[in-house]
């Protein structure tokens, strides 16, 4: 949804009795304005268990559900109850277009509420409000990976999260690295994951009506040792003008630290090849995969000398890895040619 | 083809011991969690056992918990599950399976019977 | 006694549509995807549905999965002979000394 949009459920009509979960994703700054029910006789709005004001940046009036500007707190799930009973006309989760724009992620949404002039509905346990982004159970993931687990959940009261590993309380004070509990998202993330991170993970979820749990499976696997490896088709055979500029891109992969060069082969006394069966080549530039733009080589107003093969050499621990290309220089273009090139369209 | 090959069921005195294999083949199996389940004659599936891809983390029935240790060579593409202080309650044919990220076992091997009998 | 409660037997005609249910809890049905097993005769198990609804690949479009809080349906339609088998419904269970495997007690299907 566009920005400038207004995000409308339905016109204030009758509503279903059989009122499906719906989830709407807005835009940060959407002004949004839902209905439930007639207008004189609207339900009443709640959010997470709290009855919405009529007055208000986030308001409940007449049945509608109306937010001047949606903000990352807005996010959340509303309920709409008829009133004088507690059938459920609208249920609904909003969430933010870009969850990652909330200016901090750990921040308790509830905080921003204003509890003062709000009516609390019935207790409700705590349940899964996306249980399919739970649905990955088992997690094998390389060493060095970032791993995200979800519990995204709601009752009434609002339910507190925490978390467990392999059956104890987990915090992550041991890890390297830490951990990031985004209680908002109401989730674990770890970053570059090590094979110690092995096991499973349970998100307890609880309110004082009671508790549900979820268990992920987490395993870290060990990137096999190899030789650099280097994408195919690069360096690319390239044909340039004298006088201009050529670009040779070599892409690099390696778990263990590698270690670049870029050779161009040469002709010393006629040959290409030396007494030991390998070639004559001129070390044109050399450095580790860390280093600015190690990757390309760069040669400035070419000229015919530059043509050639150029090997792009990568090695690690473990062995080396080279591919090459083909630098073809053209002369450069004929400028009366040129020039009259384009009125020769004109001529018969 | 992927492909689970059981092997080493046989028959067995109550207390003893066994070692089932399962080798795979066809698909990359250090990356996949592993798992037993068993079928007593005429009755239902019941899982046993499960592995992750590492071999650094597992799980057990309650049933066999103690008694049964799974373990997995992955240069050698095989599972393994030691079955140690049998009872004739564990008689039945022992598959081993693939599992899938959700939780499901997507490839079943043919069975291997495994008699706990005096 | 099984921790997925089946009914032990379910019977239809060829062309019929014929539904077997599966009710367990919240600790793994309420919380977990759900699966379903295709045992023929003399044979291993085939995944028939994964993720409550899914089929894997070569699984005829007759075959289809439900769940519902802490039930979960499979459901055969254009029923044939060759159907004749045990259906198995399992899940993961996340109970306090979890996580492990819960199966049904498997539900046998004849074809009338």
């Known amino acids: 949804l566009e920005a400038s949009e207004e995000v409308e459920l339905e016109p204030c009509l009758a509503p279903s009795l059989e009122q499906q979960e719906q989830e709407l994703t807005v835009a940060l700054g959407q002004p949004v304005r839902l209905c439930c029910g007639r207008a004189e006789r609207g339900g009443h709005w709640y959010k997470e268990g709290s009855r919405l004001a009529p007055a208000g940046r986030v308001r409940g009036w007449r049945g509608r559900l109306e937010i001047a500007s949606f903000l990352p707190e807005d996010a959340g799930r509303y309920l709409c109850l008829a009133r004088g009973s507690m059938i459920v006309l609208q249920n609904l989760t909003l969430i933010t277009g870009d969850s990652l724009t909330s200016s901090n992620d750990d921040e308790d949404p509830k905080s921003h509420r204003d509890p003062s002039n709000r009516h609390s509905y019935p207790q409700q346990a705590p349940y899964w409000t996306h249980p399919q982004r739970m649905e990955k159970k088992l997690h094998a993931v390389p060493a060095g990976n970032t791993v995200k687990f979800r519990c995204p959940a709601a009752g009434n009261p609002t339910p507190t999260i925490r978390w467990l590993k392999d059956g104890q309380a987990f915090h992550g004070e041991n890890r390297i690295g830490g951990i990031r509990l985004r209680h908002q998202h109401w989730s674990l993330v770890m970053e570059s994951v090590v094979p110690s991170d092995r096991g499973t993970y349970t998100c307890l979820v609880e309110n004082a009506v009671g508790s549900i749990r979820y268990n992920y499976l987490l395993d870290v696997l060990e990137r096999s040792p190899h030789r650099p490896i280097l994408q195919a088709g690069l360096p690319a055979n390239t044909t340039a003008v004298v006088g201009s500029d050529v670009e040779l891109l070599c892409k690099v992969y390696s778990d263990a630290q590698p270690h670049i060069q870029w050779l161009k082969h040469i002709v010393i006394n006629g040959s290409s090849f030396g007494a030991d069966g390998f070639p004559y080549v001129q070390v044109l530039k050399t450095a580790d995969i860390n280093s600015s733009e190690v990757e390309v080589l760069y040669l400035r107003n070419v000229s015919a000398e530059d043509a050639g093969e150029y090997t792009c050499l990568a090695g690690n621990s473990i062995g080396l890895s080279y591919q090459s290309a083909w630098l073809t220089v053209l002369p450069e273009e004929d400028p009366t040619w040129t020039a009259a090139a384009p009125e020769a369209r004109y001529t018969d | 083809e992927v492909q689970l090959l059981e092997s080493g069921g046989g028959l067995v005195q109550p207390g003893g011991s066994l070692r089932l294999s399962c080798a795979a083949s066809?698909?990359?199996?250090?990356?996949?969690?592993m798992s037993w389940v068993r079928q007593a004659p005429g009755k239902g599936l019941e899982w046993v056992s499960a592995?992750?891809?590492?071999?650094?983390?597992?799980y057990y029935a309650d049933s066999v918990k103690g008694r049964f240790t799974i373990s997995r060579d992955n240069s050698k593409n095989t599972l393994y599950l030691q079955m140690n202080s049998l009872r004739a309650e564990d008689t039945a044919v022992y598959y081993c399976?693939?599992?899938?990220?959700?939780?499901?076992?997507?490839?079943w091997g043919q069975g291997t019977l495994v008699t706990v009998s005096s | 006694q099984s921790v997925l409660t089946q009914p032990p037997s379910a019977s239809g005609t060829p062309g019929q549509r014929v539904t077997i249910s599966c009710s367990g809890g919240?600790?793994?049905?309420?919380?977990?995807?759900v699966n379903w097993y295709q045992q023929l005769p003399g044979t291993a198990p085939k995944l028939l549905i994964y993720?409550?609804?899914q089929r894997p690949s070569g699984v005829p479009d007759r075959f289809s999965g439900s769940k519902s809080g802490t039930s979960s349906s499979l459901a055969i339609s254009g029923l044939r002979s060759e159907d004749e088998a045990d259906y198995y419904c399992?899940?993961?269970?996340?109970?306090?000394?979890?996580?492990?495997?819960?199966f049904g007690g498997g539900t046998k299907l004849t074809v009338l």
């Open positions: 399992a899940a993961w269970d996340d109970s306090l000394n979890g996580p492990y495997v819960v």
């Open positions: 399976a693939r599992v899938t990220s959700p939780g499901a076992f997507d490839i």
């Open positions: 993720r409550n609804n």
């Open positions: 066809g698909f990359t199996f250090s990356r996949n969690y």
């Open positions: 919240t600790s793994n049905i309420g919380t977990n995807t």
């Open positions: 592995i992750s891809g590492s071999g650094g983390s597992t």
